[in-house]
């Protein structure tokens, strides 16, 4: 190991204070006791250290805690957290939601970094599941957080946590993710009455199967076109013209503007033209009258 430079006379730090901003990097290394730093971490945030000085302070903590920092230090890292690598964070055991919040606050406004992703991963794994309080906290800081998880990770979300999810939290979710979240939402909201239930479940409907859409069509929900366009194509195709009309209510007129886009385009191709004509929207492309409709999916299943 390289021989360490001695601290100049009278420069030994008695406490972590603003006088340290005048210290050169080597002086900080030589004159600041790591244990003192650890006990006064909460003061560091108020002192305008340069990034280079912060590197020295981090190095001192790394030497003091080679197996990873204790939570008492982690909670007070402040902007020193921005200096941590994912490798550093993997050594931590963060159990307190307050610690998580403190570190996310430091990172507020920053892009979701590998450090933050690692921190969240460590925290959630430590808890065993993504509980409501954690999900509330994470989506408050990162609205897209839920949709950054894999379907496998989402499977650990308990239905009770779904109450914390806001519509904007699902904006970037793909169908595979909604397939996992929808049954949880259905379970979470099952005791609500019709209109209230629809308001809550609406954002999750991209994962709904045909039978649930059929059931909704009987409840005068008046689904808007934006929601309809996010439904699974395979769930929409079996719906009859009458069921779609009931499902959309007054919004049915919007089908005309979307007739070239999925799932509307594919749905039109499966309907009889005379059934489509009953809507009076001028939708074209249905099965001409007199044609026989074969269910090819049954044929594929047999072959």
């Amino acid at each position: 190991e390289v021989e360490k430079t001695a601290c100049p006379s009278g420069k030994k730090a008695r406490e972590i204070d603003e006088s340290l901003i005048f210290y050169k990097k080597w002086e900080l290394e030589a004159c600041v006791d790591a244990a003192l730093l650890a006990t006064q971490m909460d003061r560091v945030n108020a002192i305008p250290f340069t990034y280079e000085q912060l590197d020295v302070l981090k190095h001192k903590l790394d030497e003091l805690y080679p197996q990873g920092y204790p939570e008492s230090v982690i909670q007070h890292l402040g902007y020193l957290f921005l200096k941590m690598s994912p490798e550093d964070i993997r050594k931590w055991n963060v159990t307190s939601l307050e610690t998580l919040k403190a570190l996310l606050e430091v990172n507020k406004g920053h892009e979701m970094s590998p450090q933050v992703a690692t921190l969240i991963d460590r925290f959630v794994k430590g808890r065993g599941q993504l509980d409501k309080d954690t999900l509330d906290t994470l989506t408050a800081f990162y609205p897209g957080y839920l949709c950054s998880l894999s379907p496998e990770e989402l499977s650990s979300v308990p239905p009770s946590s779904i109450w914390a999810v806001r519509p904007q939290d699902l904006d970037t979710c793909d169908p595979r993710q909604l397939d996992v979240l929808y049954p949880k939402a259905r379970l979470a909201f099952q005791n609500m009455n019709g209109s209230e239930y629809f308001v809550k479940i609406q954002s999750f409907l991209g994962g709904a199967p045909t039978e649930d859409l059929k059931a909704l069509s009987q409840q005068n929900v008046s689904m808007d076109l934006a929601t309809f366009m996010k439904l699974r194509t395979d769930a929409v195709l079996p719906l009859t013209v009458a069921e779609v009309q009931k499902l959309l209510g007054p919004h049915v007129e919007g089908l005309k503007a979307e007739e070239r886009h999925r799932p509307v385009r594919d749905w039109i191709l499966r309907q009889r033209q005379d059934d489509l004509d009953t809507l009076g929207l001028g939708l074209q492309g249905g099965i001409p009258n007199g044609y026989l409709v074969l269910d090819l999916s049954m044929q594929e299943a047999l072959s």
Epitope: I21, I47, T50, Y51, E52, L54, Y79, S85, H110, S113
Partner: antibody, heavy 117, light 107 residues
Framework: QVQLVESGGGLVKPGGSLRLSCAAS????????MTWIRQAPGKCLEWISY????????YYADSVKGRFTISRDNAKNSLYLQMNSLRAEDTAVYYC??????????WGQGTLVTVSS | DIQMTQSPSSVSASVGDRVTITCRAS??????LAWYQQKPGKAPKLLIY???VLQSGVPSRFSGSGSGTDFTLTISSLQPEDFATYYC?????????FGCGTKVEIK
């Protein structure tokens, strides 16, 4: 001595794109955080983005979030700002600066970006 | 965001005068404050950081003081090359923000 030289500015139509570059010399570029700051004609200075030495930590001001992307190439001693969906209000002199956390100690001479139809 | 308010917006002074510029933060920033000098057509130049630390190479006639929300830049004896616009800037939190400048003009 420390030198920062911006390039890539010019006239662009609203909705257009530009990529600014900042060539650094005279210091170990990979050791330092870097920042972009702009100054609209006759207006205040506005800090718009920074990137950590490794490139893993990034921040954007709300005014440019989702439109601008900061990046760096430590092997080339270069900092970049990719600007998309440009608006008239993005017209400014753009400066790159070395970021020391508590201050910006060296600045480039600036490059003018004009967004106009 | 933290707002930085400089006053006055301009000041007329003569060579040899003592000039004081103030900067107020909308919330406490301890000593996270820097001062810059900018001349027309040039990039800003760092004068002082951490409220009172003089940047290397900057003449000692420049000094900074203050803590919390109120800060001062003082030029003890104005020199011809000091006629410029001065900006304060906070680094206490993101986004970093600047004051809108104080122009020091020749009387």
């Amino acid at each position: 001595q420390v030198q920062l030289v911006e390039s890539g500015g010019g006239l662009v139509k609203p909705g257009g794109s530009l990529r600014l570059s900042c060539a650094a010399s005279g210091f170990t570029f990979s050791d330092y955080y870097m920042t972009w700051i702009r100054q609209a004609p006759g207006k205040c200075l506005e800090w718009i983005s920074y990137i950590s030495s490794s490139g893993s930590t990034i921040y954007y001001a709300d005014s440019v979030k989702g439109r601008f992307t900061i990046s760096r190439d430590n092997a080339k001693n270069s900092l970049y700002l990719q600007m998309n969906s440009l608006r008239a209000e993005d017209t400014a002199v753009y400066y790159c600066a070395r970021d020391r956390n508590s201050h910006f100690d060296y600045w480039g001479q600036g490059t003018l970006v004009t967004v106009s139809s | 965001d933290i707002q930085m308010t400089q006053s006055p917006s301009s000041v007329s002074a003569s060579v040899g005068d003592r000039v004081t510029i103030t900067c107020r933060a909308s919330q406490g920033i301890t000593r996270w404050l820097a001062w810059y000098q900018q001349k027309p057509g040039k990039a800003p130049k760092l004068l002082i950081y951490a409220a009172s630390v003089l940047q290397s190479g900057v003449p000692s006639r420049f000094s900074g003081s203050g803590s919390g929300t109120d800060f001062t830049l003082t030029i003890s004896s104005l020199q011809p090359e000091d006629f410029a616009t001065y900006y304060c800037q906070q680094s206490n939190s993101f986004p970093r923000t600047f004051g809108c400048g104080t122009k020091v003009e020749i009387k």
